[in-house]
C-alpha cells in the first residue's frame, strides 16, 4: 500500500481467482484513542472499533472511503483505491491503446518545435468519475524539472456504438535547451484513477522524436507569364524554432487532382518556393519536416489551382 | 529484433562487490521491461532481477533480495546489475534478457524475447 | 513452483510435448543446446512465437499447464527446454527446472 495524495491510498493486488489479497492497516488521524468506530462509504454499519482498522483487501468491494469518527463526528478519511496486477503486468483497462505508432501505446506526444514544450494526449470510452493526473520530468535516477498543467478533456468523437473522449496535457520543460544534443529522454507519467480503480501510464521519448511542425503558412501562388507553371511560396510556421538557420526545415511540395486517383506530382525542396504544373481543377499542397532529423511531416497547407 | 551485450564479470573476491552492464541496440529500449537470469555451473535457469521500462518499478529473487539494486539509463540503452557482499553461490553465468513488452517490474519472464550472450561470474577467494 | 518432466525422447521427424504446469498465467519456452551457452526464446507468452524460429514449435495452455509442441523433430532440436513464469505469491519469476530432449 502506498500514498498517492493525502488520505489516498493505493493498494496493489494480485488479480486472480482465489487470491488472498492484502492486509491492510488503518489508522485514525486523531489524538483521541478512545471510542473510535469506523464505516465505509455511505454505508452505517460499524465495521470495527479502536484507533486502528484491519481489513483483507480482496476486490473493490473492499476498496472505498473509510472513516473514522467519535460520538457522530467524523474524525479522518482514508480513500482506497485498487491497482491491479494480473500476471505480473499491471492492468490497463481505463486508457484505450492507440496501436500507433505500435502496440500498447496509451499516450501519444508532440512538440511543434524544440523549446522543451509539449503536447501528450490520451483516449478512453469512460465519461465520467475519472480523473487524471500528469508528472514529468528529464531523466528518471536524477531527474530534472519538467511542468505540467492539468489533464483536459480535448475532443469527443463517435465510434461506432461507443463514444470515445480524448485528454490533452501540456508540458514545459522547466530549463529547455533548445541546441542542445538530447542524452535523457523526457518521462511522462500518468495516474488514472476511475471509480476505485487506480493505473498508471507511462511513456518516455526525446523531443527530437515527437517533433511535428505546423503547416508552412503564407501559401501563395503566382501564375508563371505564358506558361502552365506557377510559381509557389510559403512561409516557415511561426511556432517553428528559431533562427531557421540552424532550425531548418525541408518542404514537400504536392499537386493533386480533384479525384483521389490521379497520380500526385511531388517536389522535395529545402526552399521556401517551388515551380509546378497546376492543372485544373488540382489542388497544390505543402507540408515540412525536420530537415536533419527524420520525425514527423507536418499536416499539409493547401490552396486551390483555380 | 536488437541485440543485448553482457559485460562486467570475471573473478571475485567473497564479500565484494560487482556490476554487471547490459548494453541494447537495434531496438526501442524505453519500451521494455528488462530482467536478469543466471545459471550456476550445472544448475537451471534463475530470476536474479528485473526493471520496468520507465526504472521506476524493479523486482529482486530472493536469493539476491537485500545484495542487489538493478536500475537502468535509458538515455545511454542500459541496464546495471549491482551485487554486493559476494557469495561463493553467486558464482554463474549472468544473462541480460528483454520482455516482449512493458507494464511489469521485469518479472514476466514468460514474456522474455531476446537474450544477451552472458557473462561468467566466479567468485572465489 | 513450476514442474516440468526432466527429460523426454522422440524420434526424428516424430512430433514431442513438454508440459509445464504452476500457478503462473502465462508461460514461455527457453531452448538452452548447452550448458553456459545463451538460451534462445522458442515460444513466448504462452503462443508467440519469434520471427527466427522454425514454425515446428508451438506453444499452447490449458488451466495451470503449457505445452510445449515440437512437429517434426530435428537433431538439432536436442537441448534442455525451460519453462518460464510469474510466481504470483512474490512477485518474482520462475523458471522450471528444464527437460532434457533427446532425439534418438
Known amino acids: 500500500i502506498w500514498e498517492l495524495k493525502k488520505d489516498v491510498y493505493v493498494v496493489e493486488l494480485d488479480w486472480y481467482p482465489d487470491a488472498p489479497g492484502e492486509m491492510v492497516v488503518l489508522t485514525c488521524d486523531t489524538p483521541e484513542e478512545d471510542g473510535i468506530t469506523w464505516t465505509l462509504d455511505q454505508s452505517s454499519e460499524v465495521l470495527g472499533s479502536g484507533k486502528t482498522l484491519t481489513i483483507q483487501v480482496k476486490e473493490f468491494g473492499d476498496a472505498g472511503q473509510y472513516t473514522c469518527h467519535k460520538g457522530g463526528e467524523v474524525l479522518s478519511h482514508s480513500l482506497l483505491l485498487l491497482h491491479k496486477k494480473e500476471d505480473g503486468i499491471w492492468s490497463t483497462d481505463i486508457l484505450k491503446d492507440q496501436k500507433e505508432p505500435k502496440n500498447k501505446t496509451f499516450l501519444r506526444c508532440e512538440a511543434k518545435n524544440y523549446s522543451g514544450r509539449f503536447t501528450c494526449w490520451w483516449l478512453t470510452t469512460i465519461s465520467t468519475d475519472l480523473t487524471f493526473s500528469v508528472k514529468s520530468s528529464r531523466g528518471s535516477s536524477d531527474p530534472q524539472g519538467v511542468t505540467c498543467g492539468a489533464a483536459t478533456l480535448s475532443a469527443e468523437r463517435v465510434r461506432g456504438d461507443n463514444k470515445e473522449y480524448e485528454y490533452s496535457v501540456e508540458c514545459q520543460e522547466d530549463s529547455a535547451c533548445p541546441a542542445a544534443e538530447e542524452s535523457l529522454p523526457i518521462e511522462v507519467m500518468v495516474d488514472a484513477v476511475h471509480k476505485l480503480k487506480y493505473e498508471n501510464y507511462t511513456s518516455s521519448f526525446f523531443i527530437r522524436d515527437i517533433i511535428k511542425p505546423d503547416p508552412p503558412k503564407n501559401l501563395q501562388l503566382k501564375p508563371l507569364k505564358n506558361s502552365r507553371q506557377v510559381e509557389v511560396s510559403w512561409e516557415y510556421p511561426d511556432t517553428w524554432s528559431t533562427p531557421h538557420s540552424y532550425f531548418s526545415l525541408t518542404f514537400c511540395v504536392q499537386v493533386q487532382g480533384k479525384s483521389k486517383r490521379e497520380k500526385k506530382d511531388r517536389v522535395f525542396t529545402d526552399k521556401t518556393s517551388a515551380t509546378v504544373i497546376c492543372r485544373k481543377n488540382a489542388s497544390i499542397s505543402v507540408r515540412a519536416q525536420d530537415r536533419y532529423y527524420s520525425s514527423s511531416w507536418s499536416e499539409w497547407a493547401s490552396v486551390p489551382c483555380s | 529484433a536488437g541485440t543485448l551485450d553482457e559485460s562486467g564479470g570475471g573473478l571475485q573476491t567473497p564479500g565484494g562487490a560487482l556490476s554487471l552492464v547490459c548494453k541494447a541496440s537495434?531496438?526501442?529500449?524505453?519500451?521494455?521491461?528488462v530482467a536478469w537470469v543466471r545459471q550456476a555451473p550445472g544448475k537451471g535457469l534463475e530470476w536474479v532481477a528485473g526493471?520496468?521500462?520507465?526504472?521506476?518499478?524493479?523486482g529482486y529473487g530472493s536469493a539476491v533480495r537485500g545484495r542487489a539494486t538493478i536500475s537502468r539509463d535509458n538515455g545511454q540503452s542500459t541496464v546495471r546489475l549491482q551485487l554486493n557482499n559476494l557469495r561463493a553461490e553467486d558464482t554463474a553465468t549472468y544473462y541480460c534478457?528483454?520482455?516482449?513488452?512493458?507494464?511489469?517490474?521485469?518479472?514476466?519472464?514468460?514474456?522474455?524475447?531476446?537474450w544477451g550472450h552472458g557473462t561468467e561470474v566466479i567468485v572465489a577467494a | 513452483g513450476l514442474t516440468q518432466p526432466s527429460s523426454v525422447s522422440a524420434n526424428p521427424g516424430g512430433t514431442v510435448e513438454i508440459t509445464c504446469s504452476g500457478s503462473?498465467?502465462?508461460y514461455g519456452w527457453y531452448q538452452q543446446k548447452s550448458p553456459g551457452s545463451a538460451p534462445v526464446t522458442v515460444i513466448?507468452?504462452?503462443?508467440k512465437r519469434p520471427s527466427d524460429i522454425p514454425s515446428r514449435f508451438s506453444g499452447s495452455k490449458s488451466g495451470s499447464t503449457a505445452t510445449l509442441t515440437i512437429t517434426g523433430v530435428r537433431a538439432e532440436d536436442e537441448a534442455v527446454y525451460y519453462c518460464?513464469?510469474?510466481?504470483?505469491?512474490?512477485?518474482?519469476?520462475?523458471f522450471g527446472a528444464g527437460t532434457t530432449l533427446t532425439v534418438l
Open positions: 534478457a528483454k520482455e516482449s513488452g512493458s507494464g511489469g517490474c521485469g518479472w514476466a519472464i514468460y514474456r522474455i524475447d531476446a
Open positions: 526493471i520496468g521500462s520507465t526504472g521506476r518499478c524493479t
Open positions: 518460464g513464469g510469474y510466481d504470483r505469491s512474490n512477485s518474482s519469476g520462475l
Open positions: 513466448y507468452q504462452n503462443d
Open positions: 537495434g531496438f526501442s529500449f524505453r519500451s521494455y521491461d
Open positions: 503462473s498465467g502465462s
